[in-house]
Amino acid sequence: MMTGTIETTGNISAEKGGSIILQCHLSSTTAQVTQVNWEQQDQLLAICNADLGWHISPSFKDRVAPGPGLGLTLQSLTVNDTGEYFCIYHTYPDGTYTGRIFLEVLESSVAEHGARFQIP
């Protein structure tokens, strides 16, 4: 029986040209994490395997950095990076757990404008 739950950073926004950390955490299970896949809309970004370590897809090598931990750092963000990201935890003996993060990449001026309105 799968008892675990995935906690994620949920919906996040970041500035164009900046970077962001995508983070998921598996809790409430003693299952062993054998691999974590990071995906974006039917594209493989990276894999972290318990035995083999990290594999970053060639097309993302310049903009994706492994970690911290099982998370993923996206760099040099563009508006095209806006969308859904998934962390897929492969565990033994539970099976697969999936977490979802929505990232919105904002134009620099929009991000700054939004920040000014949030500060009294």
Epitope: E39, D42, L44, I47
Partner: antibody, heavy 118, light 107 residues
């Protein structure tokens, strides 16, 4: 250099048994899942069986389930395929393949021919 | 089981030609699609993994694209050593399945 070397193929009668071996070198064998894939003469590729690196969980094609057993000895860096109740349709070249990250087969052995005939 | 349908089953082309091979899955397989090249009497060789990632050491004239159910292998400028049979393979779920193959022959 990664190397996979199959052995154990040969001519066997229908209903007979054979054990194939795949000797691995050049990488940490226990860290990788492994597949057996076969190819009948003049035909395409057919997946046969799969075994995980350390956990040892396995999976089989329906065509061989209950007759073939995949296993591994990580201390010997060797993968095995025990083939029982062999049929004429099992005649093929059998390849072992390494599977990093569970998604693709990046290295293959040269294959060993199994012929089932009376 | 997931069926993989490759087309065409064979094609004739000349050195320098752009060649496109397609592979269709019977259900969505996300990016879990790999391409292999096989020459007579030899083991298959990995060309493209995860739909679009070029395997280390494979010439950049090979490229892969697609996701979901429809995938494409493209050879931008066919070379003499590229005449071979090409297979797609899904690793989304077991049983793993291969396409029927596409034989690329010299025109």
């Amino acid at each position: 250099e990664v190397q996979l070397l199959e052995s154990g193929g040969g001519l066997v009668q229908p209903g007979g048994s054979l054990r194939l071996s795949c000797a691995a070198s050049g990488f940490t064998f226990s860290s990788y899942s492994m597949h057996w894939v076969r190819q009948a003469p003049g035909k395409g590729l057919e997946w046969v069986a799969y075994i995980k690196g350390s956990a040892g969980s396995t999976s089989y094609a329906d065509s061989v389930k209950g007759r073939f057993t995949i296993s591994r000895d990580n201390s010997k860096n060797t993968l095995y395929l025990q083939m029982n109740s062999l049929r004429a349709e099992d005649t093929a070249v059998y390849y072992c393949a390494r599977v990093p990250y569970g998604v693709w087969m990046d290295y293959w052995g040269q294959g060993t021919l199994v012929t089932v005939s009376s | 089981d997931i069926q993989m349908t490759q087309s065409p089953s064979s094609l004739s082309a000349s050195v320098g030609d752009r060649v496109t091979i397609t592979c269709r899955a019977s259900q969505s397989i996300s990016y879990y699609l790999n391409w292999y090249q096989q020459k007579p009497g030899k083991a298959p060789k990995l060309l493209i993994y995860a739909a679009s990632s070029l395997q280390s050491g494979v010439p950049s004239r090979f490229s892969g694209s697609g996701s979901g159910t429809d995938f494409t292998l493209t050879i931008s400028s066919l070379q003499p050593e590229d005449f071979a049979t090409y297979y797609c393979q899904q690793s989304y779920s077991t049983p793993l399945t291969f396409g029927g193959g596409t034989k690329v022959e010299i025109k």
